[in-house]
């Protein structure tokens, strides 16, 4: 079940994957939480979507996100991250036809309705981290990651030499 009221839920078929051009290599539904186990939730407010980072009550179901995984031809610098040296990218969709997108000008993460092929702002390079965590780097802005700021998702610039393990850009995926 999804936490967005009045929004179509995913079925087993998930999305129509017959995209022109780039196509995913696998798809699955997962809930997204922070390193500190706060849930990422989505709400429809005034005909637009808001993304929240919050502690969930025990009886409340976590919102699910459709993760579509894509291979990039760019080499992966991290051992174990890619296959045959390919980087992995993901798109994240909490409800049909809406995707998380990076707004680099506003340093924000937003939900937008869009048609395929998806814009580059909807793609994030997937990085495996310790503690069963991952991080999401903007395809359009290397070094900038989805992170948590003031109980919202935001874009956070990370200095590779210092803070790649910074807790505010670490996320957990669970079923």
């Amino acid at each position: 079940a999804f936490g967005i009221s009045g929004v179509p839920k995913y079925t087993r078929a998930l999305h129509d994957s017959s995209i022109t051009g780039i196509s995913p290599i696998t798809e699955s539904l997962a809930s997204l939480s922070t390193y500190n186990d706060q849930s990422i939730t989505f709400a429809l407010e005034d005909e637009s979507y808001e993304i929240y980072v919050e502690d969930l009550k025990k009886d409340k179901k976590k919102d699910k996100v459709l993760l579509s995984y894509y291979e990039s031809q760019h080499p992966s610098s991290e051992s174990g991250d890619g296959v045959d040296g390919k980087m992995l990218m993901v798109t994240l969709s909490p409800t049909k036809d809406f995707w998380l997108q990076a707004n680099n000008k506003e340093h924000s993460v937003e939900l937008h309705k869009c048609e395929k092929p998806l814009p580059d702002q909807a793609f994030f390079v997937l990085h495996n981290r310790s503690f069963n965590c991952v991080s999401f780097e903007c395809k359009t802005d290397p070094g900038v990651f989805i992170g948590v700021k003031d109980n919202h998702l935001a874009l956070i610039k990370v200095d590779y030499s210092e803070n790649l393990g910074s807790e505010n850009i670490l996320f957990k995926l669970s079923e």
Epitope: S23, I25, G82, V83, N132, E175
Partner: antibody, heavy 123, light 108 residues
Amino acid sequence: EVQLVETGGGLIQPGGSLRLSCAASGFTFSFYAMSWVRQAPGKGLEWVSAISGSGGSTYYADSVKGRFTISRDNSKNTLYLQMNSLRAEDTAVYYCARTLHGIRAAYDAFIIWGQGTLVTVSS
Amino acid sequence: EIVLTQSPGTLSLSPGERATLSCRASQSVGINLSWYQQKPGQAPRLLIYGASHRLTGIPDRFSGSGSGTDFTLTISRLEPEDFAVYYCHQYSQPPPFTFGGGTKVEIK
């Protein structure tokens, strides 16, 4: 070199127990979901069980649910399959297999396979 | 449980001919489907993943297509080393995952 080596197979009586191990090397073990797949003599492939990279999620075929338990020790780079209440129809070569991509989730194809270990259940 | 039905069970062809193998799922698996080749006494070998992505190093005579419930593996021109058993495998959510019964491609 990326490698999976299964051990623990053998001849066992019906109702008995056996634990299979799969030692992994050459890759970051915890990044990958793992599965057990079996093949009865002269038959096709049958998926048995899978486990996520963290070990937090486990999945089973209906034919083994309640009898088999999959687990992993990421500190030892080892996958296990505990098989209880064994039946004649469990006789097969058991393969461990690694998913293609390091996404920790099990929803992926299998790229690396072990050589297999034969389990024979017979009185 | 999703059932994968492969057809035909056996395909008798000559080297140089085109092979078309079918895999039908009892319900949609999206693009979460792969194809394997297996020869006697060997472990399976991955050919195609994500329904249509050919693994690096696999000859381009192998191609996969389809999504949802109907999938096809095509071998454009059979080489002597291609005679083997081929399996499709679905890894859709939620499990259990399943394999098809296999198609044997044999020399005519």
